[in-house]
């Protein structure tokens, strides 16, 4: 039964003599192992004997007999799966049908394979894509229908005969699917290779050829363009003419369209393959190209810079930068279209030469105020010397120069004047947009820089103002020199140290704690009259007449000042004491009299005595003594003492009479 | 902060040349102009030459046929050659920075040369 | 070149006094003139620049003035240290000193 014998394996085999043939091949015998195998070359069945008849190349049986052929063929095979074969060597004569006899227990069957062995190693076939466009990345494929383990063969690829450098990927199938080994090369082609011959050659292990393919490369590429000029170098002066020429080195396919262009753009009706420019502008200069197209696309020529040479044009600068702030650095800049490209400078500021300026740029490493102007500048090359350009203006920004504050009053001031001061300037840059005082006060600034200081004062000492643009510069201090009359006059005493008792020698001194001018005159005065004209009033031996209110006065040129009048107290113990009787020294008995023990005294008396004509003290100690009623026997000589602090004081006597009332008289 | 340091020979013969280097430190010489100056002993302050600072020079006239300024930028080194030194070129010499409308504010000691056999 | 004539040569002055030195250029400088201290044995300082601008640090008693081809130079209330030689310079046109005035003490 056919349908239980299944084989795979490739229908058809190629090797050349001496070479060898590997036969992959798998089968299935579904009623169980294999018993027989016969390898016949070129089978033919006898239906007589209804066995095959051909040259048996292997015989596998059970009595084991092996022919001699048997050493070049092997089976490779096993019982139930595998039928691998191989012929090493292969000959020519083994050309034609290969058939695999197999015969289990119960069944039979023929396998036939193709083998085609040639004379010679038969060559390799490239295969191409079916386009090849320059700079794309294509693969070439070399492909041989063999393979066999017993013979290494390899595939080497050449362009115009020289092995290529790229690196070839080679692989190699043994497979009951399919035998060969196949070669594949990645490659970028240009246009340069269009034409050439890609060679895909065989060789036997030892790198000795066996056959080989070849193959002409059609690459398709945009057309390929040299362009010549006259002038060779394309330096050329206005004026002159220039022709360019386009030619076409390559193409493939053939071109359709040719243009020029001139910086990337197209130039108008100039389709031939000369360019004749006449009479050249220095607009011209550029570079120059010409474009050809085929239906790849366009090809371009390589540029040609065209230089159209010319003196320079009038300059212009650029100053880095303005406004500059005194003590920066600053850059200038000439700038001039010219060609070839200037040589030489000349620089100017405002109009005069700066010497020793000869370069494209001016650096200056500090700008200071009088480097502001205008700068210009000349340039120069072989062509000559182009014009000066209206220039460039420097501004240069600094802070207000000497600044000075100025007193307008006529001098010197007095306190209590209205003093205007002004804040001035040398220069500024930008313009003084606001001033400072120092130290600051309630004042008015009746207009800018100006300050009134209305009824000053005599401690007004120095004043400094600041002028301000986007800086501040201070004035140093000007003294305003504040005249005025003495200060603070008071009397002190400088003796004694203690309290005056009459008798010391005392002095009095007039203070003042300023006076400006410091020239002064001293006054003493008590009760409107003058005492002295020093500054000390000096007593030698003070009575209690001198006490009393006192004022010194001291005056410069600018006016007088007078002190607090100051009291001037002696201290003396009771004097000048006497008794005083009331209503007189004669009194009628019954009635009342006083005495009263009048005293001066400082401090006043503290402590009274009274005495009779026995001098003996009597027992009342106040300023009055008060007999009621008074009798005849209180007749006599009184006196009385005082007492203070510094001593005490005794008066006369004073003799007091008592006499009879009339009812007495009466009575007697 | 800017510094001068001049190197001479101290001593040179008559009729011989004189080479001084002057190397800065502090400022570029693409940006400031270096005057060469001397003082004799017992006379006055003498301008010899300037390399300004695109390398351009310029001499004082009574010693254009004997002076030579050179520099090299990268080094910060400026060169003052003279020839035929007499005894009256006996002298201490100054490199001196300046710029553009700004005089010269840095001078270093000088080195002295003295012209003898 | 330029021709700076510097004058007086040599001035005797008192402490506490002024004293005044004059540069006359052959042609206009343009304010373009410096004053220089020098003292022996230093390198020579700059006082002045363009005509009357104080170098920073340099006391206000040193001042100068002057334009086109006349310039002065003064210091007022002499002190022992100004005791040197000065020196005009003009950058106007290359360079050029003066020939230098001795400062002494009477």
């Known amino acids: 039964d056919s349908s239980k014998w299944v084989f795979e394996h490739p229908e058809t085999l190629y090797a050349w003599e001496g070479a060898c043939v590997w036969i992959p091949c798998t089968y299935r015998a579904l009623d169980g192992d294999l018993e027989s195998f016969i390898l016949f070359h070129n089978p033919e069945y006898n239906k007589n004997t209804s066995k095959f008849d051909g040259t048996r190349l292997y015989e596998s049986t059970k009595d084991g007999k092996v022919p001699s052929e048997q050493k070049r063929v092997q089976f490779l095979g096993d019982k139930n799966k595998n039928c691998t074969l191989s012929i090493h060597p292969v000959h020519l004569n083994d050309s034609g049908q290969l058939g695999l006899r197999m015969e289990s227990k119960t069944e039979k069957w023929m396998e036939r394979i193709h083998l085609n062995v040639s004379e010679r190693p038969f060559p390799p076939h490239i295969q191409l894509p079916p386009e090849i466009q320059e700079s794309q990345e294509v693969t070439l494929t070399c492909l041989l229908n063999f393979s066999c383990y017993g013979y290494p063969i390899q595939l080497q690829w050449l362009l115009e005969g020289v092995p290529m450098r790229q690196a070839a990927v080679t692989s190699t199938s043994l497979t009951i699917k399919s035998v060969f080994t196949r070669s594949e090369l990645k490659f970028s082609p240009q246009w340069s290779h269009h034409g050439k011959i890609v060679t895909c050659q065989l060789q036997d292990a030892d790198g000795k050829f066996l056959s080989n393919d070849t193959v002409q490369l059609n690459v398709k590429h945009t057309p390929k363009l040299e362009i010549k000029v006259t002038p060779s170098d394309a330096i050329v002066r206005e004026g002159d003419s220039v022709t360019m020429t386009c030619e076409v080195s390559s193409s493939n396919p053939e071109y359709t369209t040719v243009s020029w262009l001139k910086d990337g753009t197209s130039l108008k009706k100039q389709n031939t393959f000369t360019l004749n420019l006449r009479e050249v502008t220095k607009d011209q200069s550029g570079k120059y190209c010409c474009q050809v197209s085929n239906d790849v696309g366009p090809g371009r020529s390589e540029e040609v810079f065209l230089q159209v040479q010319y003196a320079p044009e009038p300059s212009t600068v650029q100053i880095l930068h303005s406004p500059a702030v005194e003590g920066s650095q600053v850059e200038f800049l000439c700038m001039s279209l010219a060609n070839p490209l200037p040589t030489n400078y000349t620089w100017y500021h405002n109009g005069k030469e700066m010497q020793g300026r000869t370069e494209e740029k001016v650096h200056i490493p500090k700008i200071l105020p009088w480097h502001a102007g205008t700068y210009s500048c000349v340039a120069e090359n072989i062509l000559g010397t182009g014009q000066r350009g209206p220039g460039a203006e420097l501004d240069v920004q600094y802070p207000p120069k000497k600044v000075t504050t100025v007193i307008q009053n006529p001098m010197p001031i007095r306190e209590g004047d209205t003093v205007t001061l002004s804040c001035n300037y040398n220069s500024s840059n930008p313009s003084v947009t606001r001033y400072e005082w120092k130290p600051h006060g309630a004042w008015e600034e009746p207009s800018l820089g100006v300050l009134k200081i209305q009824n000053v004062g005599w401690d007004n000492t120095t004043i400094a103002c600041a002028a301000c643009n986007s800086w501040c510069s201070w004035a140093s201090p000007v003294a305003l020199n504040v005249q005025y009359a003495p200060r603070d006059v008071r009397v002190r005493k400088i003796k004694p140290l203690s309290e005056i008792h009459s008798g010391n020698s005392v002095s009095l001194q007039c203070d003042f704690s300023s006076s400006h001018p410091k020239e002064v005159q001293f006054f003493w005065e008590k009760n409107g009259r003058l005492l002295g004209k020093e500054s000390q009033l000096n007593f030698d031996s003070i009575s209690p007449e001198d006490a009393g209110s006192y004022s010194c006065w001291v005056n410069n040129s600018i006016g007088q000042t007078a002190s607090k009048a100051w009291t001037l107290e002696v201290l003396y113990a009771p004097r000048r004491l006497r008794v005083s009787m009331s209503p007189g020294d004669q009194v009628m008995e019954g009635k009342s009299a006083t005495l009263t023990c009048e005293s001066d005294a400082n401090p006043p008396v503290s402590h009274y005595t009274w005495f009779d004509w026995n001098n003996q003290s009597l027992p009342y100690h106040s300023q009055k003594l008060r007999l009621e009623p008074v009798k005849v026997q209180h007749s006599g000589a009184y006196w009385c003492q005082g007492t203070n602090s510094v001593g005490k004081g005794r008066s006369p006597l004073s003799t007091l009479t008592v006499y009879y009332s009339p009812e007495t008289i009466g009575r007697r | 902060e800017v510094q001068l340091q001049e190197s001479g020979p101290g001593l040179v013969a008559p009729s011989q040349s004189l080479s001084i280097t002057c190397t800065v430190s502090g400022f570029s010489l693409t940006s400031y102009d270096i005057s060469w100056i001397r003082q004799p002993p017992g006379k006055g302050l003498e301008w010899l030459g300037v390399?300004?600072?695109?390398?351009?020079?310029n001499y004082n006239s009574a010693f254009m046929s004997r002076l030579s300024i050179s520099k090299d930028n990268s080094k910060s080194q400026v060169f003052l050659k003279m020839n035929s030194l007499q005894t009256d070129d006996t002298a201490i010499y100054y490199c001196?920075?300046?710029?553009?409308?700004?005089?010269?504010?840095?001078w270093g000691q000088g080195t002295s040369v003295t012209v003898s056999s | 070149d330029i021709v700076l004539t510097q004058s007086p040569s040599s001035l005797s002055a008192s402490l506490g006094g002024k004293v005044t030195i004059t540069c006359k250029a052959s042609?206009?400088?343009?304010?373009?003139i410096a004053w220089y201290q020098h003292k022996p044995g230093k390198g020579p300082r700059l006082l002045i620049h363009y005509t009357s601008t104080l170098q920073p640090g340099i006391p206000s008693r040193f001042s100068g003035s002057g334009s086109g081809r006349d310039y002065s130079f003064s210091i007022s209330n002499l002190e022992p240290e100004d005791i040197a030689t000065y020196y005009c310079l003009q950058y106007d046109n290359l360079l050029t000193f003066g020939a230098g005035t001795k400062l002494e003490l009477k």
């Open positions: 390399i300004w600072t695109g390398g351009g020079t």
């Open positions: 001196v920075p300046h710029y553009y409308g700004y005089a010269m504010d840095y």
């Open positions: 042609q206009d400088i343009n304010k373009y």
